[in-house]
């Protein structure tokens, strides 16, 4: 027997559209092989009407399509504008028509009930509002007004002027009788459901002289927009539901089995744990439109998404909605990069951020995801020389190694740095990636004094102790500024005595500042790297003061008087002002990201994403 399955019989009416789903075992071969829909002839052949390879018969031109859903093991044949000529025996199948991988389908198109004379047709989107107008004559002005719905063969009362409301319409229907001058009553139904579709009859009066008017209500379900995005990339759902729901709670949900739609995020503060750290719901405009950005796309993110508006912040019957079918392409152009980076308190991390290598000139950014409210991502640093004030001296964005990757270094880590960070550019918005920084138990590998005071005109030597694990790494000192960290000459002073159980491969590398000037004040980093790949760093703040006594300064670890978590700044330390974003394209859909970067840091808890792709602070 054939493994293909579908409906044996399909019954429809003229003018209707039909979607026929055929199911196949989703093996690798089946997913990629040709899918077809053919009509069986009297002599046993089967003439192709449409196939997945793009063929469409002239009989189906402009009214049919075939869509394959390989991840589900289904393909769907949509046929519109059915006529009785479409009645017949068909096959849906895989491969070649004459082979056995097919299923027989009988399609019967009947003439249909047709609309009664004088029927007004109302076509309205799901979740919206319809007003059915019902005229009547003067003799029925004082008589009962009513609206019936034809269910099968029987009219069922929906609402009447004596106060009756059918339970299926409770809370979303009203009957309005116009002023005495107008011989018209109207029935307003809002939060329209698919089940509201059908034929209605309005009536004024109950006897043989009653006035009647027929109405045909068609409720349109939104067709899902097909969205294809790369694994590890990003997707933005733009949701415009109209000004009438501007003040109603918004949501994005993902359809699971049956008719359940699990909330991914909503404006009431709910967020699915699987999206922690990688989702933003951007503030809505006055017209009620909003957008949702999801980064770090995973295979399991594929599926059908709905955005909508409802006071509960979740999908209910009658919610106005928009739909998308998200496909996640596993043959991604976005390279793998660690989704978790670990560092120790007082230590550092170096994060590699991928970007579209065709956009090497784009501005690079790094922001901190905050879960409060609907999620926001205040910028911390960019490649144009802006650094958020609280991060001066301990955060740098480097264009290296280049060719599709930039590096962000954050040192002087504290538990408050744990959290989710986004790498992004002002170019390709699909290349947004997420990394989680975790603060783990341990000691920093590099040892430097906590803070140092230099004397004007004298010489200052600052030590940095590198353990033997970094023997093969290049060791450097640099002076931090808001555009990066400029390399400085340093001296290798032989093995360090700062490490227990560490042999001759440990190193003490010193930074020497001759004839100190005011310009030497600032942050200095020592660090390790291999080629263009950066490892751990440690930061020292050098303050400069007036000469008190002659001589040079040689700072040792013992003289350090600041804990790794502290940053000792003199009162004259200059804070860089908040930088305005120049490029208006940046975050066109997420103003919150750009507008809120000058707000104070809040406390952040680390959330374990359960990722297996982890990276230590000093590894590549």
């Amino acid at each position: 027997k054939s493994p293909i399955f579908g409906p044996e019989e399909v019954n429809s009416v003229e003018g209707n559209s039909v979607s026929i789903t055929c199911y196949y075992p989703p093996t690798s071969v089946n997913r990629h092989t040709r899918k077809y829909w053919c009509r069986q002839g009297a002599r046993g052949g089967c003439i192709t009407l449409i196939s997945s390879e793009g063929y469409v018969s002239s009989k189906y031109a402009g009214r049919a399509n075939l869509t394959n859903f390989p991840e589900n093991g289904t393909f769907v044949v949509n046929i519109a504008q059915l006529s009785q000529d479409d009645s017949g025996r068909y096959k849906c199948g895989l491969g070649i028509n004459s082979r056995g991988l097919s299923f027989d389908v009988s399609l019967e198109v009947s003439q249909g009930p047709g609309l009664l004379n004088d029927t007004k047709v109302y076509t309205v989107d799901l979740g919206r509002t319809v007003t059915i107008n019902c005229p009547f004559k003067t003799e029925n002005a004082q008589k009962r007004k009513s609206l019936y719905k034809q269910i099968g063969l029987y009219p069922v009362l929906v609402i009447d002027s004596s106060g009756y409301v059918n339970p299926n319409y409770t809370g979303r229907i009203r009957l309005d009788i116009q002023g005495t001058g107008q011989l018209l009553f109207s029935v307003v139904i809002n939060q329209l459901r698919l089940s509201d579709a059908g034929q209605y009859l309005c009536q004024a009066g109950d006897d043989s002289n009653s006035n009647k008017k027929n109405a045909d209500l068609q409720v349109l379900k939104p067709e899902p927009e097909l969205v294809y995005e790369d694994l590890r990339g990003s997707v933005t759902f733009h949701c415009a539901l109209g000004p009438e729901v501007a003040n109603v709670a918004k949501f994005l949900c993902r359809q699971s089995s049956g008719e359940n739609c699990d909330v991914v995020v909503n404006t009431l503060g709910k967020r699915a744990p699987a999206f922690e750290g990688r989702i933003l719901l951007n503030p809505q405009d006055k017209d009620g439109s909003f957008s949702v950005v999801i980064t770090g796309l995973r295979k399991e993110d594929a599926g059908r998404y709905l955005c909508g508006a409802h006071s509960d912040g979740q999908l209910q019957e009658g919610s106005p909605i928009q739909a998308w079918q998200l496909f996640v392409n596993e043959e991604s152009t976005i390279p793998r990069s660690p989704t978790v980076v670990k560092g120790v308190a007082g230590g550092s991390v170096a994060v590699l951020c991928p970007y579209n290598r065709k956009e090497s000139k784009s501005i690079k950014y790094w922001c901190l995801w905050e879960g409060a409210q609907n999620g926001r991502c205040p910028l911390l640093v960019d490649s144009e020389g802006w650094v958020k004030a609280q991060y001066e001296g301990r955060l740098s964005l480097l264009e290296e190694p280049g060719n599709g990757t930039f590096t962000v270094i954050l040192n002087q880590l504290t538990s408050r740095d744990a959290g989710f960070y986004w790498c992004l550019t002002n170019g390709d918005t699909l290349w947004r990636t997420t990394v989680e920084i975790k603060i783990i138990e341990g000691e920093p590998n590099l040892k430097v004094p906590g803070n140092v005071t230099a004397v004007l005109g004298e010489t200052l030597k600052v030590p940095c102790h590198f353990p033997c694990k970094f023997s093969s790494y290049e060791k450097y000192w640099c002076k931090w500024n808001n555009t990066g960290c400029q390399a400085l000459p340093s001296q290798d002073e032989g093995p360090s005595k700062a490490f227990v159980n560490c042999d001759e491969n440990s190193r003490l590398v010193s930074l020497t500042l001759n004839l100190v000037t005011r310009a030497d004040e600032g942050w200095y980093w020592c660090g390790v790297k291999q080629g263009h790949f950066y490892g751990e760093t440690a930061a020292v703040y050098v303050a400069v003061e007036e000469r008190k006594a002659a001589g040079s300064r040689d700072v040792s670890l013992a003289k350090a008087d600041a804990a790794p978590d502290e940053k000792v700044l003199d009162s004259g330390f200059r804070e860089i002002e908040n930088k305005a974003i120049q490029d208006p394209r940046l975050f066109a859909e997420e103003k919150a990201v750009a507008d809120t970067r000058d707000q104070a840091d809040g406390s952040r808890a680390s959330v374990d994403s359960g990722s297996s792709e982890e990276q230590g602070g000093s590894s590549r």
Partner: nanobody, 126 residues
């Protein structure tokens, strides 16, 4: 709340016929699926047949091993579904469940159906 009530199950001789009936109440939507599954002692629940109404069209699905013997049909108001079973054999012995659901995609998957009846026992003796 949707409620499904099955009836018609009984003991029947091999080769005999039987009509099962399922009456639904509370189905307020126009698009849904309604059909039959069965579960023999010690076996998984398996798909038998389903009718699905969607956007003005009706779709009929049957399991391969009941084709030519079992027929599924419905009343005009779509709230009653019948399963006519002919040429019954002992392998058809099972509890037959009526199931209904909105947005049913994979009709053969029990998990796609939201509502279930209590079941009616069909015993086919040889």
């Amino acid at each position: 709340e949707v409620q499904l009530v099955e009836s018609g199950g009984r003991l029947v001789q091999a080769g005999g016929s039987l009509r099962l009936s399922c009456a639904a109440s509370g189905l307020t939507r126009s698009d849904y699926a309604m059909g039959w599954f069965r579960q023999a002692p010690g076996k998984e629940r398996e798909f038998v047949a389903t009718l699905k109404w969607s956007e003005g069209s009706r779709f009929m699905y049957r399991a391969e091993d009941v084709k030519g013997r079992f027929t599924i049909s419905s009343g005009a108001a779509k709230t009653t579904v019948w399963l006519d079973m002919d040429a019954l054999n002992p392998e058809d012995t099972a509890v037959y469940y009526c199931a209904a659901g909105f947005n049913v995609g994979f009709v053969r998957r029990a998990s796609e159906y939201n509502f279930w009846g209590q079941g009616t026992l069909v015993t086919v003796s040889s």
